[in-house]
Interface confidence: low
């Protein structure tokens, strides 16, 4: 139903001649100007106080009539000042003015809260002409009011560059409480107090709040909105909501789950991404975080050799990116690896342990007792050495790498030779005469090339020299042995 808000009864006629409110059935308006249609009407209202001062603008025309009498000031008639209605109802209200016929092209516009209403509003202007004046009624209707229709509405009319403004019509839409702040899901520490907030507004005010925990009311008496519920602490998950009540009824907020923070579940799927002689790259899938973000993780590494002392190495790392390179491991060794992660509550249990192995390492010691001498008859250099003491982790010896550098005036030339693992001697042909040959030897395993021995130098004379003597790895303290033959 549409409730119309008409002008209040006045002791004087609203307009000269019959028209609303004393509209006769045979009296139809000469002109009806519908604006864009879209809204609809209906409602209750409280009229403004009779006799209150008129606050709208008044235009005083400077024109005089034929009898030279000044025209009366132009102003919108008093109308209802405050309309209260329920949400989704319709409303229709109007403003009216009597304009002397000497004025042409008068238009009335509607404004809400300082902005002109254009487009999708149901506004109609009707004209009722008489001998000297034309009564104009501008009506505005809304079919189904919403909270957003709350506000102050006015009419404006322009005449002779003068703007005439009506008194405001305040529209107050009442409905069920509307939440402006609802409780939010939280993750809380066990037995620790926390707050939930619920705020709802009318109109009508006041709005009262009841709190509900797991379908049971928390507070016997309602609290005025806004309400902050301080929960002293929980030991298990709970669901909270709030009910907002006003004279129109009740609205229930969304239910929010309050989770209790706990230690995380252990990581799963620990896997080996890559192994080298001294490092292992692992990855893992984090377990459930216990409703609290992971802070960091701990990688625990034990030697899997039954004869080891069972000590555990611990490596701490950030929780992301679920990847860690374990370093400083022994070559060709077996390890058990487990991962544990922590949040603010504590550490998870360790993941299932996995076995991982490092690969062979390069030798850690150079060959010993390197001796070099010139075999002039065959124009070769003979090299001898002793096999280095290899550790198990260094892997199986596969050979040796010999570096020989030939240096003479302005020339330096390095050559590399590979020798099989069984030998402990090698022969290299002389590359340059009247030059120094510097020899270094390294052991080689599948894990790589070990360190080179200290350099041993021998001088290779020009052709024709007879005497020669061996050159060998220097005793400690001799920095640069050179034996000239």
């Amino acid at each position: 139903a549409i409730t119309e808000a008409r002008e209040e009864a006045k002791p004087y006629p609203l307009f000269p001649g019959p028209f609303p409110g004393s509209l006769q059935t045979d009296h139809t308006p000469l002109l009806s100007l519908p604006h864009a249609s879209g809204y609809q009407p209906a409602l209750m209202f409280s009229p403004t106080q009779p006799g209150r001062p008129h606050t709208g603008n008044v235009a005083i025309p400077q024109v005089t009539s034929v009898e030279s009498k000044p025209l009366p000031p132009l102003a919108f008639k008093h109308t209802v000042g405050h309309i209260i209605l329920s949400e989704h109802k319709g409303v229709k209200f109007n403003c009216s003015i009597s304009v002397p016929n000497i004025y042409q092209d008068t238009t009335i516009s509607w404004w809400k809260d300082g902005k002109e209403l254009l487009g999708a509003h149901h506004a109609i202007t009707q004209f009722y002409p008489d001998d000297e004046v034309t009564a104009i009624i501008a009506s505005f209707s809304i079919t189904s009011v919403q909270r957003s229709d709350n506000g102050s509405y006015i009419c404006k009319m322009k005449i002779n560059n003068e703007e005439i403004v009506s008194d405001p019509i305040y529209i107050e839409v009442q409905g069920l409480p509307h939440f402006t702040k609802q409780p939010e899901s939280m993750n809380v520490t066990r037995n620790t107090a926390f707050n939930l907030t619920c705020q709802a507004v009318g109109p009508p005010e006041p709005v009262n709040i009841f709190w509900v925990q797991n379908s049971s009311r928390v507070n016997e008496q309602p609290e005025k909105s806004p309400s902050v519920l301080t929960v002293p602490g929980l030991t298990e998950m709970a669901v909270f909501s709030c009910e907002a009540h006003n004279d129109k009824g009740l609205t229930v907020s969304k239910g929010v789950q309050i989770n209790i923070k706990a230690i995380p579940s252990p990581p799963t799927e620990v896997s080996i991404r890559n192994s080298t002689a001294h490092s292992i790259l692992i990855s893992w899938v984090p377990g459930f975080d216990g409703y609290s973000p992971f802070r960091n993780c701990s990688i625990q590494v034990k030697e899997a050799d039954p004869l080891s002392n069972g000590s555990v190495m611990i490596f701490n790392t950030s929780a992301l990116p679920h990847l860690y390179q374990i370093k400083q491991l022994q070559a060709l060794a077996n390890y058990s690896i487990g991962v544990s992660c922590m949040n603010e509550i504590g550490w998870s249990a360790v993941s299932p342990w996995i076995l991982a192995s490092t690969t062979e390492g390069a030798p850690s010691v150079a060959p010993l007792n390197v001796t070099v001498f010139l075999n002039e008859s065959s124009d070769n250099v003979d090299i001898r050495w002793m096999k280095p003491p290899t550790k198990q982790q260094d892997g199986e010896l596969v050979g040796y790498r010999i570096s020989h550098v030939w240096q003479s005036a302005g020339i330096s030339k390095e050559l590399l030779e590979e020798v099989g693992q069984n030998g402990s001697r090698a022969r290299i042909s002389v590359q340059v005469h009247n030059a120094t040959c510097t020899v270094r030897i390294a052991a080689v395993t599948r894990g790589g090339v070990g360190p080179f021995s200290d350099p041993v130098k021998i001088f290779i004379p020009a052709h024709g020299w007879v005497d020669y003597a061996p050159s060998s790895t220097p005793a400690p303290g001799n920095a640069d042995p050179v034996l000239i033959i």
Epitope: N195, E205, P206, V207, N219, E223, K224, P226, S227, V228, L229, T230
Partner: antibody, heavy 124, light 107 residues
């Protein structure tokens, strides 16, 4: 325990401004409205306004809006009130006050906690 | 805004005497609170939500009322009760208002 510690006395000239402070401790400052109350010598209590430090929202008593400006610094848990264009009528003790904040806001509980008051004297 | 009128403005009572002071609101209020203030000190919350006694307040005090009419009663006056008492209301929206106070003196 909850404490509201206000700044010391102020002597100011008419037309000048003054900014007084209220440092809060013992509770989560940003989650409780802070109110300011005026008491002229030998007179009653007059509510000036309140601020919600969490978002800076303010409400003022109509006639004091513009003359009093409420602000809050969450980092130091301190509420401030600036009074401008002071007149002799503004000579008073100014209190900061807040509610209890347990289950209900201060609307239900009233002002449970009060600062010790700051004396502002306006004198030529 | 809602205006609170306290009466009487000043009153005196002998030890052991029952004392009642009232607070009348210009329109219905949502919540009514009472504060006690002694000279040179901050006000103390004394009664909240019409009738609930603040922590540490003697059971000699009681509060009652609804709508626009509220009262504070002391069943048996004691010397330490001499102070000024203010009522305070809070409707659905600010401003909060206080009454002018009732000064209670010991006879």
């Amino acid at each position: 325990q909850v404490q509201l510690q206000q700044s010391g006395p102020e002597l100011v000239k008419p037309g000048a401004s003054v900014k007084i402070s209220c440092k809060a401790s013992g509770y989560e400052f940003s989650r409780s409205w802070m109110n300011w109350v005026k008491q002229r010598p030998g007179k009653g209590l007059e509510w000036i306004g309140r601020i919600y430090p969490g978002d800076g929202d303010t409400n003022y008593k109509g006639k004091l809006k513009g003359q009093a400006t409420l602000t809050a610094d969450k980092s130091s848990s301190t509420a401030y009130m600036q009074l401008s264009s002071l007149t002799f009528e503004d000579s008073a003790v100014y209190f900061c006050a807040r509610g209890g904040g347990y289950y209900y806001d201060s609307r239900y509980e009233g002002f449970v906690y009060w600062g010790q008051g700051t004396v502002v004297t306006v004198s030529a | 805004q809602i205006v609170l009128t306290q009466s009487p403005a000043i009153m005196s009572a002998s030890p052991g005497e029952e004392v009642t002071m009232t607070c009348s609101a210009s329109s219905s209020v949502s919540y009514m609170h009472w504060y006690q203030q002694k000279s040179g000190t901050s006000p103390k919350r004394w009664i909240y939500d019409t009738s609930k006694l603040a922590s540490g307040v003697s059971g000699r005090f009681s509060g009652s009322g609804s709508g626009t009419s509220y009262s504070l009663t002391i069943s048996s006056m004691e010397a330490e009760d001499a102070a000024t008492y203010y009522c305070q209301q809070w409707s659905s929206n600010p401003p909060i208002t206080f009454g002018a106070g009732t000064k209670l003196e010991l006879k």
